[in-house]
């Protein structure tokens, strides 16, 4: 890519103080907070014999891995290519193709009645990964259109507080249900109760702190490229696993978690990485490819509710009759949240 | 010792061209973005735009976006800027300037300029 | 675009003397975006004060600035022969940096 006049539009200026307000710490702590809850909710609705057995069958999770690995940065670079983006434009997509996988595809595999385990079990791998995988993916996709040592940029710290965050909270929800199963019921509605609050928090805290400057980063290239990301994430990671033979809930699962990434980390990388006066707007591109997955996501589960409701008897009874064959209760969710038939390995749909 | 050599002064004639240089040492090149600045005789100073190594992105001011033409040489660190369909009123000492970074990142951004060259004198004259 | 107006345009002291020089922007600048250099006859302008009150590395401590909104000033408290020099402010907005027209202190 050549040399561009950068995107930045000339009335954009950043607000003083950005990112060091009480609002930001606010929403930076109730962020942390909220997450807590959603994993230890989560938690409960996992167990140790279903991790322990995708971890010795990693064909889901390696299928998984690969998808988020393999065809986000892919994607993210294509559509640089695609869309002729200015070279800093590029990078920011890069960056966000490159990240690992982020916590709402738990949430929203939860919501498609995806595999809790293999969820939570990817998000952790994938993050695990990303501190090698993302400088090296850095590395090879920014060449010839960054000098600098954008791999250098990769934030540890950040990517081992992400592992933190999701473990701990979810190991203790695993250990709620198996040692106190009778408070698990009180504990998920709790944790619902207060993920609930704090997301009307972060809708508040978030309008109140990015306000317009959100605008700025709202061109037709970056909104076609942040709308168009997530959905062949979520498309090609359930083609993916279909075409490897992994059964409708693993798919819904791999697929969640290829499209949802971890948007946090992209702005870590995006905030040091570039001086502020080049990557201005852009700064806010992970925000909004965040509303993208967030909405593209939401639909999707939508989407498949409605399969699910208005399913035919027919196709009622051929479901059943292919669950009971091959393990895979789709329509049947345990009390708990959890599935009959852990294993990721029939090819059904 | 971060250091901005700017190259000597240049006459030359109205409606040509001219290609001022900037090198820059002592501090890593694609980590900052090059600014350039005009100031004519006895006035003050104007922004130009800016241009940044590590990506190849530049930045113009509206006034100078078909006067100005910045160009960089990472291998030797310098940045160029040409002047085309030159005219007296071109006719300025011309700054280059570091922008200063704040490696904590983004919300520190103070936007000033830290290091300045010498300054190159451009005489437009028949 | 932001303009900048710098008040007196030229000024003189004596050694020992208090001076104010001011810059009035256009329309509301950020604090932390104003900025001033000092600039000697024939050399390149210097960082002096940055984000409105601090002192750039090497400035003496005579030197200060201050202000908010429409309004900055830089001020030296007693003013030595060497505080000879013309002084710019320069603001960043909406990706565009602008100088003031510039203040030329000069020293009985």
């Known amino acids: 890519m050549e040399a561009h006049n950068a995107s930045a539009p000339f009335n954009f200026t950043l607000p003083p103080n950005f990112g060091k307000r009480p609002t930001d710490l606010a929403l930076s702590v109730i962020l942390v907070f909220m997450l807590f809850f959603i994993m230890l909710s989560l938690g409960c609705t996992m167990e140790f014999s279903k991790i322990k057995a995708h971890l010795w069958k990693p064909k889901g999770l390696a299928i998984a891995l690969v998808a988020q690995y393999g065809i986000m940065p892919l994607t993210a670079f294509v559509l640089g290519k695609v869309f002729r983006l200015k070279n800093i434009e590029a990078l920011a997509i890069l960056v966000c193709g490159c990240s690992p996988g982020g916590n709402l595809s738990n949430v929203f595999s939860l919501a498609m009645k995806g595999d809790m385990n293999l969820s939570i079990v990817m998000t952790t791998c994938s993050t695990f990964c990303a501190l090698g995988m993302m400088p090296l993916l850095l590395y090879i996709y920014s060449r010839g259109i960054y000098d600098g040592d954008l791999k250098d940029k990769v934030p540890y710290k950040g990517i081992v507080i992400s592992l933190v965050l999701v473990l701990i909270p979810c190991t203790i929800g695993i250990v709620l249900k198996s040692k106190r199963p009778q408070y698990m019921r009180y504990v998920i509605k709790g944790g619902m109760i207060i993920i609930l609050l704090c997301s009307v928090a972060v809708t508040v805290l978030s309008a109140i702190n990015v306000g317009k400057s959100i605008m700025f980063a709202m061109t037709p290239l970056l909104i076609a490229t942040s709308s168009l990301m997530p959905f062949i994430g979520f498309l090609l990671g359930y083609v993916l696993s279909a075409l490897f033979c992994l059964n409708g809930r693993c798919r819904r699962t791999v697929s969640m978690e290829t499209g949802c990434q971890n948007v946090q980390l992209c702005s870590t990388i995006l905030n040091v990485a570039f001086p502020p006066e080049v990557i201005g707007p852009l700064f806010f591109f992970p925000l909004l490819y965040m509303i993208f997955q967030l909405g593209e996501g939401l639909l999707l589960i939508a989407i498949f509710w409605c399969y699910e409701k208005f399913k035919t008897p027919k196709d009622k009874t051929k479901m059943i009759y292919t669950a009971a064959t091959t393990e895979e209760t789709i329509p049947g969710a345990l009390g708990n949240g959890t599935y009959k038939g852990e294993d990721c390995s029939p090819c059904t749909a | 010792q971060v250091q901005l050599q700017q190259s000597g002064a240049e006459l030359v004639k109205p409606g040509a061209s001219v290609k001022l240089s900037c090198k820059a040492s002592?501090?890593?090149?694609?980590?900052?973005?090059i600014h350039w600045i005009k100031q004519m005789s006895g006035q003050g100073l104007e922004w130009i735009g800016w241009?940044?190594?590590?990506?190849?992105?530049?930045k113009y001011s509206e006034k100078f976006k078909d006067k100005a033409t910045l160009t960089a040489d990472k291998s030797s660190s310098t940045v160029y800027m040409e002047l085309n369909r030159l005219t007296s009123e071109d006719s300025a000492v011309y700054f280059c300037?570091?922008?200063?970074?704040?490696?904590?990142?983004?919300?520190?951004?103070?936007?000033?300029?830290?290091?300045w060259g010498q300054g190159t004198t451009l005489t437009v004259s028949s | 675009e932001i303009v900048l107006t710098q008040s007196p345009a030229i000024m003189s002291a004596s050694p020992g003397e208090k001076v104010t020089i001011t810059c009035r922007a256009s329309?509301?600048?950020?604090?932390?975006?104003l900025h001033w250099y000092q600039q000697k006859s024939g050399v390149s302008p210097k960082l002096w004060i940055y984000?409105?009150?601090n002192l750039a590395s090497g400035v003496p401590a005579r030197f200060s600035g201050s202000g908010s909104g429409t309004s900055y000033s830089l001020t030296i408290n007693s003013v030595e022969a060497e505080d000879a020099a013309t002084y710019y402010c320069?603001?960043?907005?909406?990706?565009?940096?602008?100088f003031g027209g510039g203040t030329t202190l000069e020293i009985k």
């Open positions: 300037a570091r922008h200063m970074r704040d490696f904590r990142g983004f919300y520190y951004g103070r936007f000033y300029f830290d290091y």
């Open positions: 002592d501090f890593t090149f694609t980590e900052y973005t």
């Open positions: 241009f940044y190594p590590g990506s190849g992105d530049i």
């Open positions: 329309s509301s600048v950020s604090s932390s975006y």
């Open positions: 984000s409105t009150s």
């Open positions: 320069q603001q960043y907005s909406g990706y565009r940096w602008t």
